[in-house]
């Protein structure tokens, strides 16, 4: 796994942003904006919500999701799980990479039924060419997207 | 936007820390310590709360703020907004880069009057030479600065 | 402190994961998995919970801990402190680098006595060869480890 940075190479990096189409409700991963505004791909590609690795190496991957609601919807578990997962051709199931669990609904106060919370994940993982990383949030109904600055997903080679 | 890392160049990086003078109360951004303790600037400069880019490129920018209080002061919205914003000569207004909203006041319980919460933001953005990045917190009164380890602001080129 | 990246050198990086043995209850730092699963060391070493620096430079260090509980244990302050600390041969005591305080116990709701919260820290610090970085959580009884994806500790040179 020796990894070199050659001075003539571009270092792979990406930052993808939340958009109205991010929440599919299909049970799949979140989808992301790749070009408009702050979003970009450099030395990485994108497919159906996934960052796709072109060049093997160690990557710092990160995601933030903005959560918000009014009280806690009925039938919604009080635990929200936000995670980064790897898809690899060598294994049939997604692999958990970085995961957080939060209980944000308890944040509604007597003076304010509206609550907001944010979940940030970041860490270094080794990724092979062709492997994919996706973001999942359960329950995604509480994710607030708005303008791409509050929920996002990115990576860069270290 | 092809960006190369030449082996003889220093990679721009900075870590700025909270200080007693960080909260201005003027509606401006937070101000930061740039030299003492853990704070440093390397290939970036600082002006009135802003990290100023010397060399164009993609930067991982980050900020953490420590929030704390007893209950929630009246006149203080129960939502706290913590964000990283860009100032560019090409546009008159600040542009949101990375933003979080939290509702920390709901954390005070009968068994504990004092609550603490922390907000972390980090992500990769493209910055041109001369552009500036600042941190804002609304309401800034709830930010705990003190010793420089709990609230901070930094960046490095990726 | 001029730091160069030579193209033939490997960039130091590490990602350590939580394991059943992480919580010692001895008042020491958290211990980590260094080899299995997602854990790795590259250009850094490990000793008794500490990442040990081999090559001096600026490092982005990070840690996430998953917190969880049922209500709040009696005798536990509602404040949880999660921090990254430096041990250096030149100074007898640990130095705080990055610290967060949270009040997660207040998150238990009437509909759910179980609560979850996550604390993320990350920032750039200068580390000399031989210096060590450790993670501490007070009260560590609330740290939830499980499978190495929820609580972790890492670093990479920038």
């Amino acid at each position: 796994l020796i990894q070199e940075r050659r001075s003539h190479e571009v270092n792979p990096a990406a930052h993808l942003t939340g958009a109205n189409s991010s929440l599919t409700g299909s049970g799949g991963p979140l989808l992301w904006e790749t070009q408009l505004g702050l979003a970009f791909l450099r030395g990485l590609s994108y497919h159906d919500g996934a960052l796709v690795v072109t060049k093997a190496g160690y990557y710092y991957i990160y995601s933030k999701v903005q959560l918000g609601g009014v009280g806690c919807p009925l039938g919604l578990a009080s635990t929200i799980t936000h995670g980064l997962y790897k898809r690899t051709p060598r294994y049939p199931e997604e692999l958990e990479l970085l995961v957080s669990q939060q209980s944000p609904c308890g944040r509604a106060t007597s003076s304010s039924r509206v609550w907001w919370d944010s979940s940030f994940l970041g860490g270094v993982v080794h990724l092979e060419a062709g492997e994919k990383v996706v973001v999942r949030v359960l329950d995604e109904r509480l994710v607030r997207l708005r303008d791409g600055t509050r929920s996002y997903f990115g990576a860069f080679m270290v | 936007l092809i960006q190369e890392r030449r082996s003889h160049e220093v990679n721009p990086a900075a870590h700025l820390t909270g200080a007693n003078s960080s909260l201005t109360g003027s509606g401006g951004p937070l101000l930061w310590e740039t030299q003492l303790g853990l704070a440093f600037l390397r290939g970036l400069s600082y002006h009135d709360g802003a990290l100023v880019v010397t060399k164009a490129g993609y930067y991982y920018i980050y900020s953490k703020v420590q929030l704390g209080g007893v209950g929630c002061p009246l006149g203080l919205a129960s939502t706290i907004t913590h964000g990283l914003y860009k100032r560019t000569p090409r546009y008159p207004e600040e542009l949101e880069l990375l933003v979080s909203q939290q509702s920390p006041c709901g954390r005070a319980t009968s068994s504990s009057r004092v609550w603490w919460d922390s907000s972390f933001l980090g992500g990769v953005v493209h910055l041109e030479a001369g552009e500036k990045v600042v941190v804002r917190v609304l309401d800034e009164r709830l930010v705990r600065l003190r010793d420089g380890t709990r609230s901070y602001f930094g960046a490095f080129m990726v | 402190l001029i730091q160069e990246r030579r193209s033939h050198e490997v960039n130091p990086a590490a990602h350590l994961t939580g394991a059943n043995s992480s919580l010692t209850g001895s008042g020491g730092p958290l211990l980590w998995e260094t080899q299995l699963g997602l854990a790795f060391l590259r250009g850094l070493s490990y000793h008794d919970g500490a990442l040990v620096v081999t090559k001096a430079g600026y490092y982005y260090i990070y840690s996430k801990v998953q917190l969880g509980g049922v209500g709040c244990p009696l005798g536990l302050a509602s404040t949880i402190t999660h921090g990254l600390y430096k041990r250096t041969p030149r100074y007898p005591e640990e130095l705080e680098l990055l610290v967060s305080q949270q009040s997660p116990c207040g998150r238990a709701t009437s509909s759910s006595r179980v609560w979850w919260d996550s604390s993320f820290l990350g920032g750039v610090v200068h580390l000399e060869a031989g210096e060590k970085v450790v993670v501490r959580v007070l009260d560590e009884r609330l740290v939830r480890l499980r499978d190495g994806t929820r609580s972790y500790f890492g670093a990479f040179m920038v």
Epitope: S110 | V70, C72, P73, L76, L142, R144 | D139
Partner: antibody
Framework: QVQLVESGGGLVKPGGSLRLSCAAS????????MNWIRQAPGKGLEWIAD????????YYADSVKGRFTISRDNAKNSLYLQMNSLRAEDTAVYYC??????????????WGQGTTVTVSS | AIQLTQSPSSLSASVGDRVTIACRAS??????LAWFRQTPGKTPKLLIY???SLESGVPSRFLGSGSGTDFTLTISSLQPEDFAIYYC?????????FGGGTKVEIK
């Protein structure tokens, strides 16, 4: 300047009532928690009640629960303590105190001069 | 209720002396502790908050330390105005409680 001035103390018989007032000036009263603390002659300090700034959440010490009522009027920059069913052991100097509770600043940093309540037959 | 036990309850010292007062909480209160000084006939004055933060305008000879259950107030060089009663107070948990006080007298 920042100031708290208590009034309303006096001599009252056991079982009687008194209403203490605390007038605030020089700061944004509505931003702060407010507390009542008392000190019996020759004794230490005893916290008796507080009221939040935001939603008027109130807590009392067990020794006064059900007998004393704390309230505030942010429009008038005033804090009150209605004391009913007074007992001899309620005899004390009563202080109101402002409490900071945000970010880097905590603690009861501003106290009134105190008003004396004597409960005696 | 959380009990705060101060020790000693009284002490005699001279101007210029270094004085240490301890405050022990019956359970963990993190850093939610304040120290007050009260001179006869006067209102209490906040010296230290959040266990170790010096209140604005308070001389630097006052030093607060500790967290969890054990706290200390140190006066590095006693001045004439420091002969008074000192109280610790926890603001972490209801009901708020004060220590019994430590009387610092002239030797």
């Amino acid at each position: 300047q920042v100031q708290l001035v208590e009034s309303g103390g006096g001599l009252v018989k056991p079982g009687g009532s008194l209403r203490l007032s605390c007038a605030a000036s020089g700061f944004t009263f509505s931003d702060y928690y407010m507390n009542w603390i008392r000190q019996a002659p020759g004794k230490g300090l005893e916290w008796i009640a507080d009221i939040s700034s935001r939603d008027n959440t109130i807590y009392y010490a067990d020794s006064v629960k059900g007998r004393f009522t704390i309230s505030r009027d942010n429009a008038k920059n005033s804090l009150y303590l209605q004391m009913n069913s007074l007992r001899a052991e309620d005899t004390a100097v009563y202080y109101c105190a402002r409490e900071r509770g945000f970010g880097d600043y905590f603690g009861m940093d501003v106290w009134g001069q105190g008003t004396t309540v004597t409960v005696s037959s | 209720a959380i009990q705060l036990t101060q020790s000693p309850s009284s002490l005699s010292a001279s101007v210029g002396d270094r004085v240490t007062i301890a405050c022990r909480a019956s359970q963990d209160i993190s850093s939610a502790l304040a120290w007050f000084r009260q001179t006869p006939g006067k209102t209490p004055k906040l010296l230290i908050y959040d266990a170790s933060s010096l209140e604005s305008g308070v001389p630097s000879r006052f030093l607060g330390s500790g967290s969890g259950t054990d706290f200390t107030l140190t006066i590095s060089s006693l001045q004439p105005e420091d002969f008074a009663i000192y109280y610790c107070q926890q603001f972490n948990t209801y009901p708020l409680t004060f220590g019994g006080g430590t009387k610092v007298e002239i030797k």
